[in-house]
């Protein structure tokens, strides 16, 4: 990807692969356009991450156009909710968070949806966003999913998401699926700055871990170790 | 645009074997996260999956009926088939072909279904 | 094999009504769930992936909730268009659905 690329201007609905520290270039979708008057958020866009459905704050040099960059970022991953990340950009592009509230700052504008988009094909699969999400969950980590000697162990597929047998034990969860687990696997750790706090949780995550893959960047692997393989907000949804 | 369609007899024997074609077009199934499925609908009844076949050749059946489901595919014509033998009168009913990616998400494009009618 | 079953099997109801389907699991399926509506004569439509998620272009009049084995469809005011069948479906473990909820 060449550097002139980092300094382009985005808008409201633009598909971009976003990349925050730790984590792999996730699908995404900017939301908000920067706000000048706000010092913390000036010349950084708000970004809605796919599959995970939380936000951030990131500037241009973070931002990579999703139509020039699939080929490179939208890989199969192992963090948990990239998969079902590269799903929605394709196919759910002007999707919300569940208790979508529209934000006062410069936001999008509401357009209609459009139709569900083609898999693949010919380019412009641009979706109008709708505005941004107040709703973000902290940052967890967990512990990845175990590597097993049976077929498709890798492939965490439809079809194939619940184990056999549980790894761990579970707690009840609440009525949104936010599940509690065992609490030495949720171990909270500071927000990164340009990530909002909020109060609700987030979404769950993917139903599919996929096939396991090295960090493209070498940069990453220590920090990604540290985090785990997970995405803001998601839990481990292997355990059963 | 993402299509599918349903070919196939309409009309079957008791014991023969029922071929049915699902031919598509908007996507590929070398394309790494890809699948197709085939489900069925008895008249005024419930759906039910029969198969499901992915870009990698790795196949699902319903446990039920997997002893008479064979799922392939033929990339280059853009077409996946299932078969099932010993055809009933119980097997009547609208089989659908359905496109689904390895994400996790629903099927969210359908073909149009094919009535099938096992009668002698 | 995970069941799936949804009550009520039929419902009549007016149009501006809450309408609420449910669907229970047999075994908890991490809400690996979706909903989809059916009209007569015509393939199922996805409505709602993973619990929660509205499809593109379903109205938002629609939801979906639940986690563990419990889960539910909400039409929050019932329009002339939403008279179908609908169906949950699982695909934790393979593919399942529910027997159907004819909405009246």
């Known amino acids: 990807m060449s550097r002139s690329n980092r300094q382009k201007e985005y808008k409201c609905g633009d598909l971009v692969f976003a990349k925050m520290k730790g984590y792999p270039h996730w699908p995404a979708r900017i939301d908000e356009m920067p706000e000048a008057a706000v010092k913390s958020t000036a010349n950084k866009y708000q970004v809605f991450f796919f599959g995970t459905h939380e936000t951030a704050f990131l500037g241009p040099k973070d931002l990579f156009p999703y139509e020039e960059s699939k080929e490179k970022f939208g890989k199969p991953n192992k963090r948990k909710g990239f998969s079902e990340g590269l799903w929605e950009i394709e196919n759910n592009p002007t999707v919300k968070a569940s208790g979508y509230q529209s934000s006062q700052k410069k936001s999008c504008v509401e357009e209609p949806e459009p139709e569900p988009e083609a898999a693949e094909g010919d380019g412009d699969k641009k979706g109008n966003a709708e505005g941004s999400s107040d709703e973000e969950g902290k940052l967890v980590i967990d512990e990845p999913a175990k590597e097993k000697n049976e077929k498709g162990a890798l492939k965490r597929r439809a079809g194939d998401l619940l184990e056999d047998s549980p790894k761990r034990p579970k707690e009840a969860e609440n009525p949104e699926g936010e599940e509690k687990e065992a609490a030495t696997l949720e171990v909270e750790r500071p927000l990164p700055m340009e990530v909002e706090k909020n109060s609700t949780p987030s979404e769950p995550g993917s139903g599919r871990g996929p096939p396991q893959e090295e960090e493209e960047e070498e940069d990453e692997e220590e920090e990604a170790t540290k985090e785990d393989a997970e995405a803001p907000g998601i839990r481990d949804h292997e355990s059963l | 645009q993402i299509t599918l369609k349903e070919s196939g007899p309409t009309l079957v024997k008791p014991t023969q074997t029922l071929t049915l074609t699902c031919t598509f077009s908007?996507?590929?199934?070398?394309?790494?996260?890809?699948?197709v499925a085939w489900i069925r609908q008895p008249p005024g009844k419930a759906l039910e999956w029969l198969a499901t076949?992915?870009?990698?050749?790795?196949?699902r059946y319903n446990p039920s009926l997997k002893s008479r489901l064979t799922i392939t595919k033929d990339t280059s014509k853009n077409q996946v088939v299932l078969t099932m033998t010993n055809m009933d009168p119980v097997d009547t009913a609208t089989y659908y072909c359905?496109?689904?990616?390895?994400?996790?998400?629903?099927?969210?494009?359908w073909g149009q279904g094919t009535l099938v009618t096992v009668s002698s | 094999d995970i069941q799936m079953t949804q009550s009520p099997s039929s419902l009549s109801a007016s149009l501006g009504d809450r309408v609420t389907i449910s669907c229970r699991a047999s075994?908890?399926?991490?809400?690996?769930l979706n909903w989809y509506q059916q009209k007569p004569g015509k393939a199922p439509k996805l409505l709602i992936y993973?619990?929660?998620r509205l499809h593109s272009g379903v109205p938002s009049r629609f939801s979906g909730s639940g986690s563990g084995t419990d889960y539910s469809l909400t039409i929050s005011s019932l329009q002339p268009e939403d008279i179908a069948t609908y169906y949950c479906?699982?695909?934790?473990?393979?593919?399942?659905f529910g027997q159907g909820t004819k909405l009246e």
């Open positions: 359905a496109q689904i990616y390895d994400y996790a998400v629903g099927f969210a494009y």
């Open positions: 908007g996507f590929s199934l070398s394309t790494s996260g890809i699948g």
């Open positions: 076949i992915w870009w990698d050749d790795d196949n």
């Open positions: 075994q908890d399926i991490s809400n690996y």
């Open positions: 993973y619990t929660s």
């Open positions: 479906q699982q695909y934790g473990k393979l593919w399942t």
